[in-house]
């Protein structure tokens, strides 16, 4: 027989087929110009040794052979023997280590038989009624045509599905979503109406991420709030990466969930913004407010579920840091300002109270007075920190107030409102004889004592009646009670105690009035 | 050693259907063309339909768009789905098993016993 032309004779090998799952596959055949045809296939498995032969039975009944030797591709005109206008079926047999393995067959008529593209260019993947909907332009000059998909999932092996019939410009495919794990899609075409035209090649991998982004599993620690009022917010544990098929390994357009930080700045409620969304690779500076996160995984079909975290309020006090002035007008506060043109946020709540009652109050942007001061002043009627006891108060600062990230902590500390030195005042002072010549007082706790750092100390004043002399003694505010010695028996003396702060002095209580007996030797 | 056992053949009144299953036993080849032939007393043996190991199918002109030729490879069984019969339908069904092609088509060396199928107006 010659290379050129179907061989109508048995194949110059025995017929012993393998059961090979390997071999060749995938053969497709069709008409390349007005008279040439070619048919081309993949084989799978080791291919030294191998020898091709394509088969060919016509309609007729007869059957021939092409040898093609090692190549997977082989082309013939329409005078090598095949009927081209009648339904031919086509084979390849491999005949390799004295074995024939077998292709599976194409029925088909080579002149109809043209040679389809798979879907070339963009595929557009969109979500449609819990099904995924894949859209791309119809190859040039191949309108009508068989649709087929496959996928599979990282675990799963390909399975093959059915996109029916196409007749437009534009082709699409209804296609199953995942709920949870990552697809791979690929399709193919071949020419509608064309009784067993070939398949084209797969098309290039579509990669479709699942329905529901991961949900993302961080974790986060928080770094000492520094000198300037700020804290890092750390990334401890990445997020888990979405485990993707075979082909969809390395790049992935289209699986890629990306994860947002939000940012819900739950102190000084009063400014205008009091939420960001960040990429979480960038971290972010916090002050030293409280805050709740939120990692938000998303893909191309939207957001998924959020994981949320709260960031306490740094409770680190510095008792110093603030003045605060009681004027027949009001209450000025007074700090060291931070920088030219800082808006201020303070922010004031009952100690011991919810944190939803936090009240507080935007300043205008300030630039630092002479002292290098900043200031924020109100008056009697406004109630603010009006009633008598104990407040937490935060000073908030930044240059740039609309920006959430740029907030930084100014001082964190106690205050106690309303007339401060009258309710401060310690009742129930009680005097007891201790020895001949000295008595213990003691008195209840100042009010102004539950209120951190408030109460500087407790003077105790002892006035004797006789000689009008007076003493004072300072006794730690943490300290209810003194020792006075010193006494002289039968004289009369008053006691009285008085709290005072860093920068008021208190109300003396009530005086007390008490004397040492006489001692009277038997 | 390769097994074809026929059934699901019958008596029915033209216009009816029957289905023909053959069940394929021993067979070592993937690649085989399975068929069915009918034989008609004092008339020669005639190709019905053939499916190929990839699905491919043949018919005779006398039965296209009436009978459906389809395979099940896991159970290596065959089917003939036999609708709108007609009294010239009636012969012996007997499935064919070809693991070879020759020059001159399947070669089909293994044969089941048949099963009538008798269609009366």
């Known amino acids: 027989c010659r290379t050129s032309e179907c061989c109508f004779q048995d194949p110059p090998y025995p017929d012993a087929d393998s059961g090979s799952a390997s071999g060749p596959r995938d053969l497709r055949c069709y008409r390349i110009s007005s008279d040439r045809y070619e048919c081309s296939w993949q084989y799978e498995g080791p291919t030294a040794g191998v020898s091709h032969f394509l088969r060919c039975c016509l309609s007729s009944g007869r059957c021939c052979y092409f040898a093609a030797g090692s190549a997977t591709r082989l082309q013939f005109s329409d005078q090598a023997g095949v009927s081209v206008l009648y339904t031919v079926t086509l084979w390849v047999e491999s005949w390799a280590r004295n074995q024939t393995e077998k292709s599976p067959e194409v029925t088909l008529q080579l002149y109809n038989s043209v040679k389809y593209e798979p879907p070339l260019g963009d595929i557009k993947v969109s979500k449609l009624a819990g099904q995924l909907r894949m859209e791309w332009e119809t190859p040039d000059n191949q309108v009508g045509a068989e649709v087929q998909f496959r996928h599979r999932t990282p675990s799963s092996p390909w399975k093959l599905g059915d996109c029916g019939p196409q007749d437009d410009d534009t082709e699409s495919c209804l296609c199953p979503l995942e709920m949870n794990v990552a697809q791979e899609f690929q399709l193919r075409r071949r020419q509608l109406g064309s009784q067993g035209s070939s398949w084209s090649k797969w098309s290039s991998p579509v990669c479709v991420p699942p329905e529901n982004p991961p949900q993302p599993q961080v974790r986060f620690s928080v770094e000492q709030l520094g000198q300037d009022g700020r804290r890092r917010l750390t990334l401890k544990e990445q997020p888990t990466q979405l485990e993707l098929p075979e082909g969809c390994q390395g790049l992935a357009p289209g699986t890629e969930v990306t994860y947002r930080l939000q940012l819900h700045m739950l102190s000084c409620p009063c400014k205008a913004k009091a939420t960001r969304t960040l990429h979480l690779g960038k971290m972010p500076y916090l002050s030293g407010a409280a805050y709740n996160v939120a990692v938000i995984s998303s893909n191309q079909f939207g957001p998924g579920l959020n994981q949320t975290w709260h960031i306490p309020a740094d409770t680190h006090t510095e008792p110093v840091a603030l003045n605060i002035s009681v004027g027949t007008n009001g209450t000025t506060m007074y700090w060291p300002a931070r920088a030219q043109s800082m808006t201020y946020c303070i922010e004031w709540q009952p100690v011991g109270q919810d944190g939803g009652l936090a009240t507080c109050s935007l300043t205008a942007p300030q630039d630092p007075d002479p002292a290098g001061m900043a200031t924020y002043s109100w008056s009697r009627e406004s109630g603010a920190m009006g009633q008598e006891k104990c407040y937490y108060i935060t000073i908030f600062a930044s240059a740039h107030p609309e920006k959430l990230t740029l907030w930084s902590t100014v001082l964190s500390t106690y205050h106690f409102g309303g007339n401060a030195s009258a309710a401060g005042t310690p009742h129930h002072v009680s005097v007891k004889n201790h020895s001949l010549d000295s008595v213990s007082v003691d008195w209840a706790p100042s009010l102004l004592s539950t209120c951190p750092g408030v109460l500087k100390e407790y003077v105790v004043r002892c006035r004797d009646e006789d000689s009008k002399q007076v003493s004072e003694h300072p006794v730690q505010p943490t300290e209810t009670q003194v020792t006075l010695s010193g006494l002289r028996a039968g004289v009369a003396y008053t006691v009285q105690v008085r709290a005072d702060t860093a920068w008021l002095r208190g109300v003396w209580s009530q005086p007390q009035r008490f004397s040492i007996e006489v001692q009277v030797s038997d | 050693q390769v097994q074809l056992v026929e059934s699901g053949g019958g008596a029915v009144q033209a216009g009816g259907s029957l289905r023909l299953s053959c069940a394929a036993s021993?067979?070592?080849?993937?690649?085989?063309?399975m068929a069915w032939f009918r034989q008609a007393p004092g008339i020669e043996r005639e190709f019905v339909a053939s499916i190929w190991w990839g699905g491919s199918t043949y018919y005779a002109d006398s039965v296209k768009d009436r009978f459906t030729i389809s395979r099940d490879n896991a159970e290596n069984t065959v089917y003939l789905q036999m609708n709108s019969l007609k009294p010239e339908d009636t012969a012996v069904y007997r499935c064919?098993?070809?693991?070879?092609?020759?020059?001159?088509?399947?070669?089909?060396?293994?044969w089941g016993q048949g099963t009538q199928v008798t269609v009366s107006s």
């Open positions: 064919a098993v070809g693991t070879k092609i020759g020059t001159m088509g399947p070669r089909y060396d293994y």
């Open positions: 021993g067979l070592t080849s993937r690649h085989y063309v």
